[in-house]
Amino acid sequence: KFSKQSWGLENEALIVRCPRQGKPSYTVDWYYSQTNKSIPTQERNRVFASGQLLKFLPAAVADSGIYTCIVRSPTFNRTGYANVTIYKKQSDCNVPDYLMYSTVSGSEKNSKIYCPTIDLYNWTAPLEWFKNCQALQGSRYRAHKSFLVIDNVMTEDAGDYTCKFIHNENGANYSVTATRSFTVKDEQGFSLFPVIGAPAQNEIKEVEIGKNANLTCSACFGKGTQFLAAVLWQLNGTKITDFGEPRIQQEEGQNQSFSNGLACLDMVLRIADVKEEDLLLQYDCLALNLHGLRRHTVRLSRKNPIDHHS
């Protein structure tokens, strides 16, 4: 609970925010968890704490580990954990999966690629952008604020995009790179009122208390690339992100598949360590597009484990 993964490359700047939410201006103390050693706040140190931020300027492989942050007040301390991994720079062009941020999709109408984590840094425009390690050149590519815009997107534009920028700290400059995949959706086709393939309406799913459970919300929206189509889960009518139960998470990003030429999306709801109270919740699979919204409701019921007798 209250833990977040962060990663970076050696000799680059890495800035990590305390995963425990507080309000700005509160005192935040940082510790290296393995030794319980306090992280200094003096900026002359290579690794130092600055309020809710922990700064590695620059990062080293040996910095990898778990860092504890405590947001302090006289009556209520709040503790979070940042799991930091610093990797050696690759000699070849390939960016390994563990360095990739979430995949984004684009189409001819919408082709923005945001540079991940950039809001944590003190940077100035313009950003440099690379695709599969090649610097992007030509009028089709426009670096705008913290994102890249690609004009007249084609299927060939799919690939791994890296943003590179300079973080400035007290007059010293540090390089930062971040990579994410970009996929292109085809614009051909038509759209229909959403059709939910799974789950069935008012389905009862059997789960075992204490085990993990997955629910898949799958819907089709028409043929070809769909503009404004989404599937999502709600708990008791509330978005998963707003419901705030860390054990219950939607799989980040929506998987797109083409079934019999139809454009379909699915979203997996993962419930870790199923508890009794989960059986009382209403799970709604929502599919929506420009035509409207369709909802299928699922409820969980207890599955009694089969007794094994020798």
Epitope: G22, S25, Y26, T75, G244
Partner: antibody, heavy 117, light 111 residues
């Protein structure tokens, strides 16, 4: 958006127990933060009653501690206030509110409880 | 318990003018470089709304006309310039220790 809503009887007889529930939507109360009860007698100022934090730990105002119980119902995403042996002095608007650290950033609309026979 | 005393009990201000409310604590509410004093606005029939936390930090979404200052035992909430919809009761609250306590309130009326 986080929302809090108080509910419970508007009239309680003297010496009985006042019971109120705060239903939270938009956030799971067991995920984080502290969840408070505050009251305000008609035309008067605010009095902090106590809170329960995300882990179930409670802290009460010593002036009310012997009569107060705050508990949580995780399955309904609710927390509750019980105030025993009430008198007319307990007549007030009762608010529930969320504390991120130690100021209260989200409040319910409040519910008036009158203690009268 | 820490007692918070607000003054004045009420004040009337013309739109465009400055309104100043003070809150005095019976003992210091400052420690470790922070002052654990917060300010709320309450309009009739509504719950309180957080304006300022840690003595001087503006809560998200609150207009910059509101500002807070002070440390130790003496704190001030300033509204400048006052607008017609600022008519309300204003309360200070400390969180230096348990129990949290509030001031008795200051009623701001608009002339």
């Amino acid at each position: 958006q986080v929302q809090l809503q108080e509910s419970g009887p508007g009239l309680v007889k003297p010496s009985q127990t006042l019971s109120l529930t705060c239903t939270v939507s938009g956030y799971s109360i067991t995920s984080d933060y502290a969840w408070n009860w505050i009251r305000q007698p008609p035309g008067k100022g605010l009095e902090w009653i106590g809170y329960i934090d995300y882990s179930g730990s409670t802290t009460y105002n010593p002036s009310l501690k012997s009569r107060v119980t705050i508990s949580v119902d995780t399955s309904k995403n609710q927390f509750s206030l019980k105030l025993s042996s009430v008198t007319a002095a307990d007549t007030a608007v009762y608010y529930c509110a969320r504390t991120v650290i130690d100021s209260m950033d989200y409040w319910g609309q409040g519910t008036l409880v009158t203690v009268s026979s | 318990d820490i007692v918070l005393t607000q003054s004045p009990a009420s004040l009337a201000v013309s739109p465009g003018q400055r309104a100043t409310i003070t809150c005095r604590a019976s003992k210091s509410v400052s420690t470790s470089g922070h002052s654990y004093m917060h300010w709320y606005q309450q309009k009739p029939g509504q719950p309180p709304k957080l304006l300022i936390y840690l003595a001087s930090n503006l809560e998200s979404g609150v207009p910059a006309r509101f500002s807070g200052s002070g440390s130790g035992t003496d704190f001030t909430l300033t509204i400048n310039p006052v607008e017609a919809n600022d008519a309300a009761n204003y309360y200070c609250q400390h969180s230096r220790e348990f129990p949290f306590t509030f001031g008795q309130g200051t009623k701001v009326e608009i002339k």
